[in-house]
Amino acid sequence: MACLGFQRHKAQLNLATRTWPCTLLFFLLFIPVFCKAMHVAQPAVVLASSRGIASFVCEYASPGKATEVRVTVLRQADSQVTEVCAATYMMGNELTFLDDSICTGTSSGNQVNLTIQGLRAMDTGLYICKVELMYPPPYYLGIGNGTQIYVIDPEPCPDSDFLLWILAAVSSGLFFYSFLLTAVSLSKMLKKRSPLTTGVYVKMPPTEPECEKQFQPYFIPIN
């Protein structure tokens, strides 16, 4: 809370306007000395997406011109603290996590945008942002109050490949069934027909219930 501009109770400077050079001198001399406590701010609650992705911003009040910053995400559950991921970056450069990390991130000034992927309901917990100013000295450590990430597993769905196989099997079955039905119907009709007679097709009223709305042609031989 030592940093002017970041503490909750700011100093009240009731100085007459004629003393502005002293005020300026005070800020030039004392802010580099006292503006040192590194407050880390992060959102209180974040809800992960249905795909298990959660994003939040971790912002730190840098007390100096740090060139090398280390950001670590820690998970606190049942008073146990475990490291989720960590990245060291040079100011102005991209944030690079290890290849197998579940975290990705981008940096912009004193803000780090963190994204955690592959989260499941069992991963619900308090995710703490830890920021370390590694270089140049002095070293500063700031730890946020944590972001409670809630992860809700989506309703279990069958595998998409499995669904495709079921769909293919059903449609193939229907196709062969309709093909067979057509073949049987044709063969029956051809057996009933005399090779020398001519015939006409007339539309007969439906024999099926009204809801079917389908009129099937019947062959009527003309004597």
Epitope: M1, H9, A11, F34, K36, A37, V81, K130, Y140
Partner: antibody, heavy 123, light 111 residues
Framework: EVKLVESGGGSVKPGGSLKLSCAAS????????MSWIRQTPEKRLEWVSS???????YFPDSVKGRFTISRDNARNILYLQMNSVRSEDTAMYFC?????????????????WGAGTTVTVSS | NIVLTQSPASLAVSLGQRATMSCRAS??????????IYWYQQKSGQPPNLLIY???HLKPGVPARFTGSGSRTDFTLTIDPVEADDAATYYC?????????FGAGTKLELK
């Protein structure tokens, strides 16, 4: 120059009261976590109390309910009100400012100390 | 409460030699991947003066002759080489758990 000056120490009978003051200069006291630490005649250091910028106060069990910590922002002074004093409260009392190199949910450490004021509890 | 045990209680070292003192915690003082141990120097008639914070980091202005190391429960302060101005009592402090506590100190004397 950053400076802390304690005053108000002296001799007091067991069960009595005493109020210590800590005048800060070179910085705004209300912007910092401030604490009282004491050093016993055996040279052991003991944390006594802390006051945060947002007004929260903290005490160890040994003084809880007997000591209170307060602050006068206008005068830039930190106080320690000692009531129901005991012989084990005899010590040199230091006013100290929290170190700036760490911010987080853990306690305090101290980068600026006053010269101290002596409290003697004796019948 | 976490108890910090410092050893030895006193130490006599020749000028230019190395002085090593220990601080052992009754339980781990590690949290968030950091050990919350601090070292102070107190000269006779003066208040304590912060030397090292967060186990190994030197307060600006403190000579590089002072180094802090350790983790979890075992911590060490090393002064190499020792100078005449280093004669003092050295205290360790933890703030990983309330209440914050100090060790009983190690008194460094010069031979």
């Amino acid at each position: 120059e950053v400076k802390l000056v304690e005053s108000g120490g002296g001799s007091v009978k067991p069960g009595g009261s005493l109020k210590l003051s800590c005048a800060a200069s070179g910085f705004t006291l209300s912007n910092f976590d401030m604490s009282w630490i004491r050093q016993t005649p055996e040279k052991r250091l003991e944390w006594v109390s802390s006051f945060t910028p947002d007004g929260n106060t903290y005490f160890p069990d040994s003084v809880k309910g007997r000591f209170t910590i307060s602050r006068d922002n206008a005068r830039n002074i930190l106080y320690l009100q000692m009531n129901s004093v005991r012989s084990e409260d005899t010590a040199m009392y230091f006013c100290a400012r929290k170190g700036p190199y760490y911010y987080g949910p853990r306690g305090w450490f101290f980068d600026v100390w006053g010269a101290g004021t002596t409290v003697t509890v004796s019948s | 409460n976490i108890v910090l045990t410092q050893s030895p209680a006193s130490l006599a070292v020749s000028l230019g030699q190395r002085a090593t003192m220990s601080c052992r915690a009754s339980e781990s003082v590690e949290g968030y991947g950091t050990s919350f141990i601090y070292w102070y120097q107190q000269k006779s008639g003066q208040p304590p003066n912060l030397l090292i914070y967060l186990t190994s980091h030197l307060k600006p202005g403190v000579p590089a002759r002072f180094t802090g190391s350790g983790s979890r429960t075992d911590f060490t302060l090393t002064i190499d080489p020792v100078e005449a101005d280093d004669a003092a009592t050295y205290y360790c402090q933890q703030n990983n758990e309330d209440p914050l506590t100090f060790g009983a100190g190690t008194k460094l004397e010069l031979k």
